[in-house]
């Protein structure tokens, strides 16, 4: 049975040209995390795999940095980066957990709340996502909570 819950940074805003940290945390389960996917709508941004470490999608290499931990840092933000982001935790034996973050990139300093949301993780609750998301075949050691390259 899936007992875990995903906490995320929730709905966040940031200024155009700035950077933002997307964070998720899986708790209340002893399941081993074999891979974490970061996805934006229908695009794969990055993966942190227990065996293979971090891999960033080539089209995002210039603007996406791994971490901190299992999070993802988006840099040089544009208004087009506004939208939904998903962290997909592939775990064994539980299966797949998905967290959702909505990012709004604003033209000016209207993005005053961005940093505040970064300080406190927003409790999102458990969601088992049905489509398009993937567990990796081959993660044996599991990912540490802090993540990073292995």
């Amino acid at each position: 049975m899936m007992t875990g819950t995903i906490e995320t940074t929730g709905n966040i805003s940031a200024e155009k040209g700035g950077s933002i940290i997307l964070q998720c945390h899986l708790s209340s389960t002893t399941a081993q995390v074999t891979q974490v996917n970061w996805e934006q709508q229908d695009q794969l941004l990055a993966i942190c795999n227990a065996d293979l470490g971090w891999h960033i999608s080539p089209s995002f290499k210039d603007r996406v940095a791994p971490g901190p931990g299992l999070g993802l840092t988006l840099q040089s933000l544009t208004v087009n980066d506004t939208g939904e982001y998903f962290c997909i935790y592939h775990t064994y034996p539980d299966g797949t957990y998905t967290g959702r973050i909505f990012l709004e990139v604003l033209e000016s300093s209207v993005a005053e709340h961005g940093a505040r949301f970064q300080e406190n993780l927003y409790f999102q609750g458990l969601e088992h996502h049905h489509h398009h998301h993937h567990h990796h075949h081959g993660g044996s050691g599991g990912l540490p909570e802090t993540g990073g390259d292995r």
Epitope: M2, Q32, T34, Q35, N37, E39, Q43, L44, I47, N49, L52, H55, S57, P58, I88, H90, Y92, P93, D94, G95, T96, H128, H131, H132, H133, H134, H135, H136, H137, G138, G139, S140
Partner: antibody
Framework: EVQLVQSGAEVKKPGSSVKVSCKAS????????ISWVRQAPGQGLEWMGG????????DVAEKFQGRVTITADKSTSTAYIELSSLRSEDTAVYYC???????????????WGRGTLVTVSS | QSALTQPRSVSGSPGQSVTISCTGT?????????RSWYQQHPGKAPKLMIY???YRPSGVSNRFSGSKSGNTASLTISGLQAEDEADYYC??????????FGAGTKLTVLG
């Protein structure tokens, strides 16, 4: 439309090799793993291995290690399997299948090619 | 011999329900969530019906449902129809282990 188009049927001699291709379209090829599954006449499904273009990672089932080479060409969105030292028991339909979700090999498979019949006969 | 055991055949009449079981016989394919079911008609490629034990891909009829208890996963087909007659394969795909298929179950729709 998401689809996988496989190369045509092959007839091979024992001891030779065969290379089957699987061209993907309708999605971002590099983001999804592609696996190869075969089915001998009247038999069940057998997973042979797969490739994750995103990682350039290849997994091959223990039974086929040393005889199977799985590759992918991202520029043409095509995956390949090559099976060497063919024997009569390798006669089968070879399917390529796409992972349901992004990022790895060995998931449930939601998109399948139509299959390529490989006949090994002297 | 597969590490997943399925009955060779099952049958039912139109409108009835049938259940196909799939038992993991090794630790690698034990009581984890990574189980799926495929339907295959003669001469056709397999079709994914259920994944991660109980989730249906879009486009699959809600007459198909999956469940699991311990090492045994089950596929239940309710309101049986003639077009359901096919072979059904369960699959296990745990991390750090090969994908494994069961030997398949032939479903016959009677009458």
């Amino acid at each position: 439309e998401v689809q996988l188009v496989q190369s045509g049927a092959e007839v091979k001699k024992p001891g030779s090799s065969v290379k089957v291709s699987c061209k993907a379209s309708g999605y971002t090829f590099a983001s999804y793993g592609i696996s190869w599954v075969r089915q001998a006449p009247g038999q069940g499904l057998e997973w042979m291995g797969g490739i994750t273009p995103f990682f350039n990672r290849v997994d091959v089932a223990e039974k086929f290690q040393g005889r199977v080479t799985i590759t992918a060409d991202k520029s043409t969105s095509t995956a390949y399997i090559e099976l060497s030292s063919l024997r009569s028991e390798d006669t089968a339909v070879y399917y390529c299948a796409r992972d349901l979700r992004r990022g790895g090999v060995g998931d449930a498979f939601d998109i399948w090619g139509r299959g390529t019949l490989v006949t090994v006969s002297s | 011999q597969s590490a997943l055991t399925q009955p060779r055949s099952v049958s039912g009449s139109p409108g009835q329900s049938v259940t196909i079981s799939c038992t993991g016989t090794s630790p690698d394919v034990g009581s984890h969530a990574y189980r799926s079911w495929y339907q295959q008609h003669p001469g056709k490629a397999p079709k994914l019906m259920i994944y991660e034990v109980s989730y249906r891909p879009s486009g699959v009829s809600n007459r198909f449902s999956g469940s699991k208890s311990g090492n045994t996963a089950s596929l239940t087909i309710s309101g049986l129809q003639a077009e359901d007659e096919a072979d059904y394969y369960c699959s296990s795909y745990p991390p750090s282990s090969a994908t494994v298929f069961g030997a398949g179950t032939k479903l016959t729709v009677l009458g």
